[in-house]
Interface confidence: medium
């Protein structure tokens, strides 16, 4: 459950993630497990530690094995294990199954494909983007944040696609490619509003104080591609991102399609180390699509320890 | 107070476009959503449609799709709404909207107006 | 989408007196989870935008007489304006935002008598 597979290729910048998750103030131990030897935290290091990243600037193939990663706190720690792997650039245009991200599918309606890992690394726009190696220009082709836009798809946009961008450290760049499939499938599906199954309104969730907590906004659309569905959390009517709390933060969580084909959408609210104040805030979880849009509220309340226990 | 301050009067020809915007004074669309309601001469008001840039995307009337572009400049707290393809019965004022939620439901927050003319 | 029909679509009221409007949605404006009627009341006086007096069919909007106010579910709504002032006329528009596009209904000229 704690060990994750990461990849890169040879000369690019691979930063990974801790696949325990800690408080910000905790500190993050990083090893080669093959050696124990503990990976230096010096930014002059080609790879180092950073919190709960560890970062290859660049990899090399010899980089590759087992990293283990021990989130310490006060009162215990946490051990995750990174198994990365470094390849040899390839010669010819192929990119082989093991470089591969998840592969993702869009219709004539959507057609977003994203940058895989793109959040863990300080890039600036804009993306370039390659379909089985070549460049994509023309109005079709849209680069818009971290995903590529493809107007009017057609089956013949299946293929492997490639984004590539450069990782800026200390005023140093360094390029990272990655690539998955795109399929094209036909549009069969329908929508309807947004229904909200998780968490119910005006729920009242049990948290205990300096402890993590999670809430997971989940709302389905319709079935089959859904031209615009979107779900996030707000807090306090505020966007998340402009609230300022570091401690409190959103994730996406999977697209899910049910084997009913209902198309759902999950957005998980991580709360580090719980204060007394987080219990004063209202918690949004909004969904929204072509129909309307549709808010869930959830209040926090404090967990009696006894309740834990029993 | 936040104000939102509209483009002033236009006078177009049909088939052509117009693009009216909407300040945010003394305030911004972050986290906002922009509605945009127009009223022909003597007529009702009429929903055209709204960017909620909380989700970063714009939801249109059916009746204007294709023919509307609602956008947002957080930078300058403006947002724009661009009409195409313009006949006679777009003549109307055309009002930017907000609401205190920043969820384009409902709106508590006018501009006061933009009359766009069409006429050959 | 969703129609909106007001009625009447005039009304003389004497000052002091009540004023009523009725706003009828074509399909049930009520979301049952949250038990909340997405609808929205306006005052709109010539060559002025319009005002927002009531939201989620019964909360008063900011500054707003409490002589004014909303009630109603599901299709049925009413405006009522307790004792007419003479800053009262003005054209009111009831709107539905469950459901994209939002739509307004023809609008309730209301006059003094």
């Known amino acids: 459950k704690f060990s994750k597979q990461s990849w890169g290729l040879e000369n690019e910048a691979l930063i990974v993630r801790c696949p325990r998750q800690g408080k910000p103030s905790y500190t993050v131990d990083w090893y080669y497990s093959q050696t124990n030897k503990s990976i230096p935290t010096q930014e002059r290091n080609r790879v180092f530690a950073s919190g709960q990243l560890l970062k290859f600037l660049p990899a090399a193939v010899a980089d590759s094995g087992i990293y283990t990663c021990i989130v310490r706190s006060p009162t215990f720690n946490r051990t995750g294990y990174a198994n990365v792997t470094i390849y040899k650039k390839q010669s010819d245009c192929n990119v082989p199954d093991y470089l591969m991200y998840s592969t993702v599918s869009g219709s004539e309606k959507n057609s977003k494909i994203y940058c895989p890992t793109i959040d863990l690394y300080n890039w600036t726009a804009p993306l370039e983007w390659f379909k089985n190696c070549q460049a994509l220009q023309g109005s079709r082709y849209r680069a818009h944040k971290s995903f590529l836009v493809i107007d009017n798809v057609m089956t013949e946009d299946a293929g492997d696609y490639t984004c590539k961008f450069i990782h800026n450290e200390n005023g140093a760049n360094y390029s990272v490619t990655a690539t998955r499939s795109f399929t094209v499938k036909d549009e069969q599906g329908f929508s309807l509003f947004p229904v909200i199954g998780a968490p119910a309104q005006n729920e009242i969730k049990e948290v205990e104080i300096g402890k993590n907590a999670n809430l997971t906004c989940s709302a389905c659309f319709g079935k089959g591609t859904q031209f615009l569905a979107a779900v996030l959390w707000q807090l306090n009517g505020t966007k998340i991102t402009d609230f300022g709390e570091p401690r409190i933060q959103q994730e996406e969580g999977q697209n899910q399609s049910f084997s009913n084909g209902l198309a759902c959408l999950d957005m998980v609210l991580r709360i580090a180390d719980v204060k007394e104040e987080d219990l004063l805030l209202q918690y949004d979880c909004l969904a929204l699509n072509l129909h309307g849009l549709r808010r869930h509220t959830v209040r926090l309340s404090r967990k009696n320890p006894i309740d834990h226990h029993s | 107070q936040v104000q939102l301050v509209q483009s002033g009067a236009e006078v177009k020809k049909p088939g052509s476009s117009v693009k009216v915007s909407c300040k945010a004074s003394?305030?911004?669309?972050?986290?906002?959503?922009v509605n945009w309601v127009r009223q022909a001469p003597g007529q009702g008001l009429e929903w055209m449609g709204g960017f909620v840039s909380l989700f970063g995307t714009a939801n249109y009337a059916q009746k204007f799709q294709g023919r509307v572009t609602i956008t947002a400049d957080e930078s300058t707290s403006t947002a724009y709404m661009e009409l195409s393809s313009l006949r006679s019965e777009d003549t109307a004022v055309y009002y930017c909207a907000r609401d205190r939620e920043g969820l384009g439901w409902y709106f508590d927050l006018w501009g006061r107006g933009t009359l766009v003319t069409v006429s050959s | 989408d969703i129609v909106m029909t007001q009625s009447p679509d005039s009304l003389a009221v004497s000052l002091g007196e009540r004023a009523t409007i009725n706003c009828k949605s074509s399909q049930s404006v009520l979301y049952s989870s949250s038990n909340e009627n997405y609808l929205a009341w306006y005052q709109q006086k010539p060559g002025q935008p319009p005002k927002l007096l009531i939201y989620?069919?019964?909360i008063r909007g900011s500054g707003v007489p409490d002589r004014f106010s909303g009630s109603g579910s599901g299709t049925d709504f009413t405006l009522t304006i307790s004792s007419l002032q003479a800053e009262d006329v003005a054209v009111y528009y009831c709107?539905?935002?469950?459901?994209?596009?939002?739509?307004f209904g023809q609008g309730t000229k209301v006059e003094i008598k």
């Open positions: 989620w069919a019964s």
């Open positions: 709107q539905q935002y469950y459901s994209i596009p939002y739509t």
């Open positions: 003394g305030g911004s669309f972050s986290g906002q959503a």
